[in-house]
Each structure stands twice: as C-alpha cells, then as structure tokens.
C-alpha cells in the first residue's frame, strides 16, 4: 500500500499529511463523543511524538496505525479508513507491526475507542505544533 518511502517526502508534504490527520482526528473524536456515558480509561496509552520529533519520523506512525487498525476492527466510522491511509504514508516499508489486544467487553471497547481517539487528536495537535515551530526555526 506504500507508494513512496517516507524519506522521499518533503517536510511540507509531511505537514500537509499531519494537518489532514489533525482534521480527521477531530471528526473521529466528535463522533465517538456522541456515545454518552463513556469515560476515558487510564489503561490505554497511545505513543505519540518520537524522541527527536523531527521530520520524517515526527510521530510513532507504525504504533499509532496499529491502534487505529484495532479501532477499525471494532468500529466502521467513515473516517477511520482514511486516517489509516494517511498514516500509511508516514511509515517506512520495513516498520514492525505493533500488537494490541482487542477489548472484548462492550463497555471496555467503547472506553478503548474514546481514550485512543482523544489521545490521537491531542497527538496530532502536538505533532503539528512541533512541525510548525520547527519550520519557523529553520527560516530564522
């Protein structure tokens, strides 16, 4: 599914992808939050920025994608496939697959989806902030 390895992407391309992911993450979270009475869980943590948070490896794309693919097994909200497709663009072809256990209890499924969706949305905000501040530093 990968057309170009990540290192062929320009920082401006990466920023465009992250901007799109930020927008999609907000849509996903908005829809997930329609399910009232579900609380965020402390049991799940989505990896976000890489230690150096520099393009092209600004975020832990393979791990994030693995979490979104797990959500996709549980839910077919329309934006999830698109999010996964965008994350694919930010992944090296030889990236190892992260294993995530799928919750089986109905309520725990909903908590997992809400928690990861919220963390993903926050992560995209951070990634975009990091990219834009890095771009400003590069021009000064």
């Amino acid at each position: 599914s990968h057309t170009l390895p990540v290192h062929f992407l320009q920082p401006s391309d990466i920023q465009k992808i992250v901007e799109e992911l930020q927008s999609l993450s907000k849509m996903l979270l908005k829809d997930v939050k329609e399910d009232k009475g579900v609380l965020v869980s402390q049991n799940y943590t989505l990896p976000c920025l890489t230690p150096d948070a520099q393009p092209p490896n600004i975020i832990h794309s393979p791990a994030i994608r693995a979490y979104l693919k797990t959500i996709r097994q549980l839910d077919n909200k329309s934006v999830i496939d698109e999010i996964i497709e965008h994350l694919d663009k930010l992944i090296f072809q030889d990236a190892p697959e992260t294993n995530i256990s799928v919750p089986t209890d109905t309520h725990e499924c909903k908590r997992f989806i809400l928690t990861i969706s919220q963390q993903f949305s926050e992560c995209m905000d951070l990634a975009l902030k990091s990219l834009t501040s890095g771009a400003q530093q590069a021009t000064t």
């Epitope: 908005k30 829809d31 549980l74 077919n76 934006v79 496939d81």
Partner: antibody, heavy 124, light 110 residues
Amino acid sequence: QSQLVESGGGLVQPGGSLRLSCAASGFSFSANYWICWVRQAPGKGLEWIVCIYIGSRADTYYAPWAKGRFTISKDNSKNTVYLQMNSLRAEDTAVYFCARFSSGIYDLDRFFLWGQGTLVTVSS
Amino acid sequence: AFQLTQSPSSLSASVGDRVTITCQASQSIDSWLAWYQQKPGKPPKLLIYQASKLASGVPSRFSGSGSGTDYTLTISSLQPEDFATYYCQTYYGGGHIGWGFGTGTKVTVL
C-alpha cells in the same frame, strides 16, 4: 419506538426517475450508525444498494452496479434519507427497504432496524 | 469485487433436524457478519450479529460461529416456524469491502 418508514414507491415508466424517502421516527440522526438502502426483486434475494454515514461526514458507499444511476442523500433537519433513482429499467422493479446499522461491532442489536419497504414497479 | 458466498441455496429438512448454513467472504470481515430470517412479504428479521451474538427475542436454538472469512448459522432443532429463507450479511462498511448479502438459503419441509 424507533421506526424507519419508506415512501415514494409506485409505478414508473422505463427511463423515468423516482425519489424514495426513508423517515426516521423515535430517534434522531446522530453519529455512530449507517443508513442503507437494500432492494429485493420479486422472488429474489436481498441486494445492497448504498449506505450513508450519519456523523461528521456524510460518507457514502455504493454497490458498484448502483454508481451513476442511484444517489443517496440525507436531511438531518427532517431526519430523512433519500434515494434518487434515475434511468429506471424493468429489472429495477423491487421492494426497496431502508435499514439502520450500527457503526460499532460491539453495539447491541437495537442498532439493527429495518423499514417495511416500498414497492417500485418499472413498466410501460 | 467483494463477495459473500452462501451455501446451500436451498435445503429440505424435517422438524427436529439440525440445520447448518455457511457463508464465505472473499476477504476477511473481522466478524462483521449478521444472519437474518425472512418470510414472504416481510422485512428481514435479525437473528445473529457480530457473527455469534444472539439478537434479543431470538430462540437459543439459533447460533452463529466463525471468524475471518468463514461463518456458520446453525439451527439445533428445526421448528415449524423456522421454514423460511436465511441470509448472511456483512456490515463492515468502508471502501475496501463495502456491504453485501449472501445469496440466501431457502429452508423447506422435507
């Protein structure tokens, strides 16, 4: 009591158009489910036509054969989903159902809801 | 194109018989599978969702199993009211698979 009610069926000539409506009552349009149109020709099986997502984006998925002639849309203020059918042919004669499906695999069967169907007859 | 292959297309059985209907997807649908019963002039009635969960009000003689691409509906002891047509359906959604129904299995009296 949640209900889906189809309307707009009837007799139409080949090449004609028809717009079917699927009105939701007992629940309001919000995220986390899809509304789909399914048809059943006399004595035949169920055939999926198209689905629309009820949420942030009105994403749509069409059966390959339905693209071009059939168009799904929704009006949140009226709690209604529509199916616009153009260039109708005799083989489009069928009972047209609308149905609601959960977007979550974990959800209870209350998310599976079908209307009673509306008959469309294409004949000269 | 994505396909759901249901078999057999028809079967004849007697009251008390154990009946098995299979549904095979052309690619994995992650248990996004429902089974319906339909009688003439009526909309389909949900029996099983998420491959194996019994819908409310459905007798326990109906059961579903399977994962990945292969799924089964079993009626442990056929009752007079069970003579009908049965359909499998995927509601996976998304652009890569879409939605769809099996071709149906008509269960008639032997």
